[in-house]
């Protein structure tokens, strides 16, 4: 067997694959959750039909020190065309409701599964 690791950069992930990988990571989080996710941290609820990826990142990026969602934060940063920093709320037009991270993840997962089923990979 030949090991090619490190020699060739992997090709860009097609949108459908990228979306599936994000769904798989969110499934992972919900299934492996034992204690309250991120110690029960609260984040802004988002409108899942309006510029969802950047808005989701803007909400979740304000949770620090929670290893369980670090991969999700990283993945979402690749799903947003502009750079998002903690405390930035450009895509989060309405900030009126806070929910627990666990609920946020569940809501996002349900919506992404629906998009995937409908073939909306954009």
């Amino acid at each position: 067997l030949t090991c090619l690791g490190g020699f060739a950069s992997p090709g860009p992930v097609p949108p459908s694959t990228a979306l599936r990988e994000l769904i798989e990571e969110l499934v992972n989080i919900t299934q492996n959750q034992k204690a309250p996710l991120c110690n029960g941290s609260m984040v802004w609820s988002i409108n899942l039909t309006a510029g969802m990826y950047c808005a989701a990142l803007e909400s979740l990026i304000n949770v620090s020190g929670c290893s369980a969602i670090e991969k999700t934060q990283r993945m979402l940063s690749g799903f947003c065309p502009h750079k998002v920093s903690a405390g930035q709320f450009s895509s989060l037009h309405v900030r009126d409701t806070k929910i627990e991270v666990a609920q946020f993840v569940k809501d996002l997962l349900l919506h992404l599964k629906k998009l995937f089923r409908e073939g909306q990979f954009n």
């Epitope: 860009p12 992930v13 949108p15 990228a18 979306l19 039909t49 309006a50 510029g51 969802m52 990826y53 950047c54 940063s77 690749g78 799903f79 065309p81 502009h82 750079k83 920093s85 450009s90 895509s91 073939g119 909306q120 990979f121 954009n122």
Partner: antibody, heavy 118, light 109 residues
Framework: EVQLVQSGAEVLKPGATVLISCKVS????????MHWVQQAPGKGLEWMGR????????KYAPKFHDRVTITADTSTDTAYMELSSLRSEDTAVYYC???????????WGQGTLVTVSS | QAVVTQEPSLTVSPGGTVTLTCRSS?????????ANWVQEKPGQLFRGLIG???NRAPGVPARFSGSLLGDKAALTLSGAQPEDEAEYFC?????????FGTGTKVTVL
């Protein structure tokens, strides 16, 4: 004043590699993604990829992913785009452009003409 | 890979209104495509006009507005000025990469 200043025109042979620089001023380099765009003669625009100068994380367009490398040097506030295995159809003007939510593609370099000819 | 198409050319009278559209081959354009509009004038730097579907870039006149129109992204120019004569490109975000549209040449006549 925000400025993006690119390196000069290049004439190269097929198979060669070109490295274009984009030196920025007037803002904090690491605060924004830098994108690169190609415009071939008489053609439209093609997005090539982008970099987060803070950590070097990149995204590339499917068309270019195996030949393009985007890097950033935070010590000089300069982004670089390297395109390898050049062919005649890579003859184009290449642009760096800053992108953010409030200023989408708001600032552009002056462009660098790359001519690939044997 | 998606293809993003625009009207090749449109003509508008000075003071008139024109709407440019941007269609995706993969289906309806949504807010998660973060539609962008860029202006190109000969001999000048490109200029970003609109991002995130409807956010005007700083310094862009209010006569330029972005929206979703049916299943497409749209750029509406209300009260066209002679200096608005240019090529306009849209760009749509597909989860992890942009694809630019074919471009629309707008003539103010």
């Amino acid at each position: 004043e925000v400025q993006l200043v690119q390196s000069g025109a290049e004439v190269l042979k097929p198979g060669a590699t070109v490295l274009i620089s984009c030196k920025v001023s007037g803002y904090t380099f690491t605060d924004y993604y830098m994108h690169w765009v190609q415009q071939a003669p008489g053609k439209g625009l093609e997005w090539m990829g982008r970099i987060d100068p803070e950590d070097g994380e990149t995204k590339y367009a499917p068309k270019f992913h195996d030949r393009v490398t985007i890097t950033a040097d935070t010590s000089t506030d300069t982004a670089y785009m390297e395109l390898s295995s050049l062919r005649s159809e890579d003859t184009a003007v290449y642009y760096c452009t800053r992108y953010d939510y409030y200023g989408p593609f708001a600032y552009w370099g002056q462009g660098t003409l790359v001519t690939v000819s044997s | 890979q998606a293809v993003v198409t625009q009207e090749p050319s449109l003509t508008v009278s000075p003071g008139g209104t024109v709407t440019l559209t941007c269609r995706s081959s993969t289906g309806a354009v949504t807010t998660s495509n973060y539609a962008n509009w860029v202006q190109e004038k000969p001999g000048q730097l490109f200029r970003g006009l609109i991002g995130g579907t409807n956010n005007r870039a700083p310094g862009v006149p209010a006569r330029f507005s972005g929206s979703l129109l049916g299943d497409k992204a749209a750029l509406t120019l209300s009260g066209a000025q002679p200096e608005d004569e240019a090529e306009y490109f849209c760009a749509l975000w597909y989860i992890n990469h942009f694809i630019f549209g074919t471009g629309t040449k707008v003539t103010v006549l």
